[in-house]
Interface confidence: medium
Amino acid sequence: SAPGEDEECGRVRDFVAKLANNTHQHVFDDLRGSVSLSWVGDSTGVILVLTTFHVPLVIMTFGQSKLYRSEDYGKNFKDITDLINNTFIRTEFGMAIGPENSGKVVLTAEVSGGSRGGRIFRSSDFAKNFVQTDLPFHPLTQMMYSPQNSDYLLALSTENGLWVSKNFGGKWEEIHKAVCLAKWGSDNTIFFTTYANGSCKADLGALELWRTSDLGKSFKTIGVKIYSFGLGGRFLFASVMADKDTTRRIHVSTDQGDTWSMAQLPSVGQEQFYSILAANDDMVFMHVDEPGDTGFGTIFTSDDRGIVYSKSLDRHLYTTTGGETDFTNVTSLRGVYITSVLSEDNSIQTMITFDQGGRWTHLRKPENSECDATAKNKNECSLHIHASYSISQKLNVPMAPLSEPNAVGIVIAHGSVGDAISVMVPDVYISDDGGYSWTKMLEGPHYYTILDSGGIIVAIEHSSRPINVIKFSTDEGQCWQTYTFTRDPIYFTGLASEPGARSMNISIWGFTESFLTSQWVSYTIDFKDILERNCEEKDYTIWLAHSTDPEDYEDGCILGYKEQFLRLRKSSVCQNGRDYVVTKQPSICLCSLEDFLCDFGYYRPENDSKCVEQPELKGHDLEFCLYGREEHLTTNGYRKIPGDKCQGGVNPVREVKDLKKKCTSNFLSPEKQNSKSN
């Protein structure tokens, strides 16, 4: 039988009455256009909703927008358009919400063609009040907050000026002209690229990378011949043009650009690209595109310096620059990532790693599923996950995979079971152990969200017809109840719940359509009365993450340590609550060769954990560029995996002897860098 229809599925008592008392409808007095929704702060209950409607006239487009505010998680909304003087807000800039709980909001207004500059509306009290500010420039990008200080904003102008405000947008100063891209770094540092000969596009590959650490009082050129740059974790990356040809290489800095090292990655040509798939303070996943229009490349994982890279996954699906990749960080379990590969026969298959890219495998076939038509062997196949690529291909996939850090082990995704991703209508699958095992959770495509740190999962069927039913589960998707939230079905457009999955409120967004008008409508359902009591100690059970053989002493060891979690029992119907903190207990493991990656000049043969010297380098002194010097590297071939905490066990030792010769590579050594002050 389908999940949720088994006899043993316990029913939540009187749930219809409980939910009916906690269902709040709000009809927006708006013609249907577009709607965008932003949460302001964490656990504040404040939501801003911006509706926009365009009326195309013969010579121009007339726009109208309305702003609504809720302070009870979407149960009630108040029209606050008058606070922004009924101004039309530009949706392409969205609502710029300040970091953390700053309560800051910036809205960018549409202004008439002849005006000297743009206009913004600023709030620093969670959108209770707004201040109108006229800008001395026309913004090209959304205002960007400094992660360290929400009073510091930066923006690029349509004339490529870099503008900075130190008082939350009240006063603006142009600190540099001819700027292509600007990003906040740590400690209120700004990194940006500049062009010299006309435009960003014309100078691509000849840009300069600059840094200011004092909001534009002084500058330092930290790179030349720059194609692009990026920040990931504690790493600053720049792709730099080679001296002799049109290829470029990645260079990396861990000291804000003072010193650079050439990453041991393949160079790429004009039509290829690099992409930082994921980065943290320990390491980075880097995608390097294959030559030609193949649609795939190779994933490499870095060492702790971002310099030495190990090949992690071949034929990684990634369509063109800025295109689609299915690479997904499973945030509910450490070390787990899911992505797709393009196989030789051009079919797409899902791969998963549990050890931060060390090894990739297919997803285990769900026990309650049959292999589909793509499977050669009906008894042997895998689960394949639909993600960004499937969505871009307009398959019937309404949502990407979902996981939440505080809903430990839970992953929800659309998928098909076979030898490759199928174009057939997908079903929804759930894993409760971070991707090791999977179960079919719902038949057909659905929207889904996690509430109360995993205590409740909510789903709505993806349908072209109007809907009025929501499904929910209190046991991690094993059993489902259905609730009719309105008599009059609506055209569903989206589910909204507070980011972080701690809330017990869900908002269902859609529109009603009648002969004369269509209107936006939201239904907010509070599940607090379904989970009647607070969870107690007895409601939780110990769960060893990454466990495959509970007796084995090394069971659960990933990156040198194992973690035991307190997990809510599936049978417990209770509230984790907004203050729920994941209880985890790490313990150190013995080091094995799996805890080390191969150092520069070494590689791991297939199905072998030992690192062996690359044949072409055997017997040669290994020389590579590090911090702008040439180093002589004496190594036994191993380097500890970034973030690995193992102790004892095997301990391959490594030493680096410094020859202090200048590098011949073309990146900047500190001596070549220059500074200037405003």
Epitope: Y553, I588, S592, G649
Partner: antibody, heavy 118, light 107 residues
């Protein structure tokens, strides 16, 4: 019944060697990490060494590193501790103990006494 | 190395008494602590693991509490067979270390 039985203890002179054995029964020996722990005459417990379930990985306390070697033979369900360059302060009752991924030191043997004296 | 400081070193008690033994770790060890019982001439016996979890077959009068650096073993109502020496052990990181032991003797 889960059981661990140590043997091989005795009197040895400083600088001498001894090999302790631990015979395991009643459980799947090859899936458990195994430790040696000693109890000194003043009844303090000191963890000595551990070996992973497959036998590939070991770890030692600083006091015995370089002198003691822990090993196992999964085909014989046996754990060993080769003790070289013995010192007076190594005098203790030596216990073997098993550890799973969830449980540390959950099963112990009766111990074997090692006395290092001239 | 992580030091485990156990107190008291001995306690005199009668049958039916509530006995509490504490262990302090020199740094945070999450809940990676176990409690062991030693009786003369008998093998050590594991009582509690992960700070609070009772090993199968161990009477419910034994309980563990604490997390981080401070931990407690409690015997709610002392029974004749509970007179023994109790040790805590941390297994958060190598080298594993033990408390000095607490001897529970008859008053």
């Amino acid at each position: 019944e889960v059981q661990l039985v140590e043997s091989g203890g005795g009197l040895v002179q400083p600088g001498g060697s001894l090999r302790l054995s631990c015979a395991a029964s009643g459980f799947t020996f090859s899936t458990y990490g195994m430790s040696w722990v000693r109890q000194t005459p003043d009844k303090r417990l000191e963890w000595v060494a551990i070996i992973s379930s497959g036998g590939s990985y070991t770890y030692y306390s600083d006091t015995v590193k370089g002198r003691f070697t822990i090993s196992r033979d999964n085909s014989k369900n046996s754990l060993y501790l080769q003790m070289n360059s013995l010192r007076a302060e190594d005098t203790a009752v030596y216990y073997c103990s098993r550890s799973s991924s969830h449980w540390y030191f959950d099963v112990w043997g009766q111990g074997t006494l090692v006395t290092v004296s001239s | 190395d992580i030091q485990m400081t156990q107190s008291p070193s001995s306690v005199s008690a009668s049958v039916g008494d509530r006995v509490t033994i504490t262990c302090h770790a020199s740094q945070g060890i999450s809940s990676n602590i176990g409690w062991l019982q030693q009786k003369p001439g008998k093998a050590f016996k594991g009582l509690i693991y992960h700070g609070t979890n009772l090993k199968d077959g161990v009477p419910s009068r034994f309980s563990g509490s604490g997390s981080g650096a401070d931990f407690t073993l409690t015997i709610s109502s002392l029974q004749p067979e509970d007179f023994a020496t109790y040790f805590c052990v941390q297994y958060a990181q190598f080298p594993y270390t033990f408390g000095q032991g607490t001897k529970v003797e008859k008053r």
